[in-house]
Interface confidence: low
């Protein structure tokens, strides 16, 4: 396995070493002395949900009792690598990503549960989990093999305006149909209540004499 980690050692100076040249002191402080790789595991493939959310576990085998861990998600497309998000957390505490980050996560021992939101089909790619044990020394770095996240855009919904027009048309149709039905029903009811008439009026004498006026019946001959 390629060496991905460097062990940092603080130079412990005694009286004799204080006379050493500055250059030698520089090398002792800043040149890595030992090399140790830290293994990081993550699932090979994850399919994002229809809402563009993908979750996966990033598991690292810690070679020591780290108190401060930094987790970074990298996206690799072809030969290009970009940083998706990063968070530093103290063991036992929650991961805190930036407010505008598309990532959220929780930690449990040597496992980090990562969730990436707002993914689209164009975001399909290899997402690599990078873990760094920041404190206490020695520093360790581990890089996972990556999780291939597949994102499939959902089928586009029909135009909302079009749906609104259909709803309005159906509603209007039902309204006019009910209106017509009510009108017909009312007219039928009214017809049933009124007496039958021929439409021909005949002058009839009153039943009781009115002001002593006498009405004589008359006859109209028709030739």
């Amino acid at each position: 396995m390629a060496c991905l980690g460097f062990q940092r050692h603080k130079a412990q100076l005694n009286l004799a070493t204080r006379t050493w040249p500055c250059t030698l002191l520089f090398f002792l402080l800043f040149i890595p002395v030992f090399c140790k790789a830290m293994h990081v595991a993550q699932p090979a493939v994850v399919l994002a949900s229809s809402r563009g959310i993908a979750s996966f576990v990033c598991e690292y085998a810690s070679p020591g009792k780290a108190t401060e861990v930094r987790v970074t998600v990298l996206r690799q497309a072809d030969s290009q690598v970009t940083e998706v998000c990063a968070a530093t957390y103290m063991m036992g505490n929650e991961l805190t990503f930036l407010d505008d980050s598309i990532c959220t996560g929780t930690s449990s021992g040597n496992q980090v549960n990562l969730t990436i939101q707002g993914l689209r089909a164009m975001d399909t790619g290899l997402y690599i989990c990078k873990v760094e044990l920041m404190y206490p020394p020695p520093y360790y770095l581990g890089i996972g093999n990556g999780t291939q996240i597949y994102v499939i855009d959902p089928e586009p919904c029909p135009d909302s305006d079009f749906l609104l027009w259909i709803l309005a048309a159906v509603s209007s149709g039902l309204f006019f149909y009910s209106f017509l039905l009510t009108a017909v029903s009312l007219s039928k009811m009214l017809k049933k209540r009124s007496p039958l008439t021929t439409g021909v009026y005949v002058k009839m004498p009153p039943t009781e004499p009115e002001c002593e006026k006498q009405f004589q019946p008359y006859f109209i001959p028709i030739n």
């Epitope: 396995m1 062990q7 090399c35 140790k36 085998a61 810690s62 070679p63």
Partner: nanobody, 135 residues
């Protein structure tokens, strides 16, 4: 359910040999590390030996190097601890334990072997088998 069952313990004379077995069930040994630990009365549990199943790397406590040998059998999902040249100080209850390999250092050396023989690194434990070395 993960289960580890030890067998092969017993009474043996100093200089004698015993072979302990640790049968795993509920999971395959791939990607796991199996360790043997022992606990003598009134003492802390100490690491004896460990083997990483995937690559067969082995680790031994200084006190048993050259005398004990750990081996794995894929087909039987079992790990063995061959104990030769036994001494009275080897008397203890021997436990077998399992841990996912990802929870352990990926490279041996540089102090990493410490974690392979550290009891708190292990997740699953057997019930133990008694080994008594006495004349």
């Amino acid at each position: 359910e993960v289960q580890l069952v030890e067998s092969g313990g017993g009474l043996v004379q100093p200089g004698g040999s015993l072979r302990l077995s640790c049968a795993a069930s509920g999971f395959t040994l791939d990607y796991y590390a199996i360790g043997w630990f022992r606990q003598a009365p009134g003492k802390e549990r100490e690491g004896v030996s460990c083997i990483t199943i995937s690559d067969g790397d082995t680790y031994y406590a200084d006190s048993v190097k050259g005398r004990f040998t750990i081996a794995r059998d894929y087909a039987k999902n079992t790990v063995y601890l061959q104990m030769n040249s036994l001494k009275p100080e080897d008397t203890a209850v021997y436990y077998c334990a399992a841990v996912h390999g990802l929870k352990l250092p990926s490279q041996r050396g540089l102090g990493g072997s410490y974690y392979y023989l550290l009891a708190r690194s292990y997740d699953y434990w057997g019930q133990g088998t008694q080994v008594t070395v006495s004349s």
